[in-house]
């Protein structure tokens, strides 16, 4: 069997054996080693010498196998843009940011660049649960049967109606999507001006 090519090696078809860890260098028409994550090219390859890599300095990173001659500068999560840090920058990974609580990503360019406040869901609705927090604005959906939500809020959840009988009371007024059931003491009539949820 043919011996495995070790960089640098000639490539006539401009492709390299290991696309992830090697790259085609057109000036010399050879395949050279890429630098692993967390490093950069300190010495470029030639026909007789392979790439030499060096570790990224503090506060800089390269995330992938690369042939970059510099490392990328770590950037903080910008609170003015509504972002907060969830993981610090390392030599192999940029700072991980997310939208602050109560915000969603309004501008996306490979990563979130700008967050905005989530819209309120009106009474009788709640925000549809998403797979990923902060990914999009609220989509308000009606409370399901037997539940209510009585505020304008981006995060309030629909709650189940109170079951009067569980408290030894009787229903004075049924719950709606926007209000809870009104309960009363079974021995007392409900005065018309009373609007409390529960009368003792």
């Amino acid at each position: 069997s043919q011996p495995q090519a070790v960089p640098p090696y000639a490539s006539e078809n401009q492709t390299c054996r290991d696309q992830e860890k090697e790259y085609y260098e057109p000036q010399h028409r050879i395949c050279c080693s890429r630098c692993p994550p967390g490093t950069y090219v300190s010495a470029k390859c030639s026909r007789i010498r392979d790439t030499v890599c060096a570790t990224c300095a503090e506060n800089s990173y390269n995330e992938h196998w690369n042939y970059l001659t510099i490392c990328q500068l770590c950037r903080p999560c910008d609170p003015v843009m509504g972002l907060e840090e969830i993981a610090p920058c390392t030599s192999k990974r940029k700072t991980q940011c997310r939208c602050q609580p109560g915000m969603f990503c309004a501008a996306w360019a490979l990563e979130c660049t700008h967050c905005e406040l989530l819209s309120d869901c009106p009474p009788g609705t709640e925000a549809e649960l998403k797979d990923e927090v902060g990914k999009g604005n609220n989509h308000c959906v009606p409370c399901k049967a037997g539940h209510f939500q009585n505020t304008s809020s981006p995060s309030a959840r629909c709650q189940p109606h109170t079951r009067c009988e569980n408290q030894g009371l009787v229903e004075a007024a049924p719950g709606t999507a926007q209000s809870d059931t009104t309960c009363k003491n079974p021995l007392e009539p409900l005065p018309p001006e009373m609007s409390g949820t529960m009368l003792m």
């Epitope: 300190s42 010495a43 390859c45 030639s46 026909r47 007789i48 010498r49 030499v52």
Partner: antibody, heavy 120, light 107 residues
């Protein structure tokens, strides 16, 4: 202007070890260059021995590889050559040189050379 | 290893002469060829690389050409300071190798 200066014993006994140092001035050994050793037996042609990068990466001439060690000392801005088990055939003028990385691998700066004689 | 040969091994010429030195590689080396000048008791000096780029500070009377296996160093008008030995060097594959040299002396 980069300057290179070889130093070391001019006489080495057969089967002994030849040791030379090259001091780099007018530039940093930590720059993007390879630091090389080339020798020239009296009245003959040039032979590349090997070279080193400042991180310690080395390349050696296969014909000498088993006997050669090149090392670097960044704190002193110098690099060194050790050639073991020497014979009279290793008598030569030894040059240190610089080769910029990523080029067509030419040697653009040379030391003045030092003659090393292998004799008992 | 790639073998490098040079011709002639020596030549005698006069000041003002046009001089050609040939270097041949044992296999194709594309354009990976460099030329050096060496004077007695001195280190080699880079003249030309890859194989027609003039090194900084080298007079324009020196020129180089060729590709593949055959290369030429030309001195258009020989000057007194040009009497020396000239070496070619390939850097196409490891190890880099040098030609045996061409000595240019005064006629």
């Amino acid at each position: 202007q980069v300057q290179l200066q070889e130093s070391g014993p001019g006489l080495v006994k057969p089967s002994g070890t030849l040791s030379l140092t090259c001091a780099v001035s007018g530039g940093s050994i930590s720059s993007s260059n390879w630091w090389s050793w080339v020798r020239q037996p009296p009245g003959k042609g040039l032979e590349w021995i090997g070279d080193i990068y400042h991180d310690g990466t080395t390349y050696y001439n296969p014909s000498l590889k088993s006997r050669v060690t090149v090392s670097v000392d960044k704190s002193k801005n110098q690099f060194s050559l050790k050639l073991s088990s020497v014979t009279a055939a290793d008598t030569a003028v030894y040059y240190c040189a610089r080769s910029p990385s990523g080029t067509t691998d030419y040697f653009d700066y040379w030391g003045q050379g030092t003659l090393v004689t292998v004799s008992s | 290893d790639i073998q490098m040969t040079q011709s002639p091994s020596s030549l005698s010429a006069s000041v003002g002469d046009r001089v050609n030195i040939t270097c041949r590689a044992s296999q194709s080396i594309s354009s990976y060829l460099n030329w050096y000048q060496q004077k007695p008791g001195k280190a080699p000096k880079l003249l030309i690389y890859a194989p027609s780029s003039l090194q900084s500070g080298v007079p324009s009377r020196f020129s180089g050409g060729g590709s593949g296996t055959d290369f030429t160093l030309t001195i258009s008008s020989l000057q007194p300071e040009d009497f020396a030995t000239y070496f070619c060097q390939q850097s196409y594959s490891t190890p880099p190798t040098f030609g045996p040299g061409t000595k240019v002396d005064i006629k």
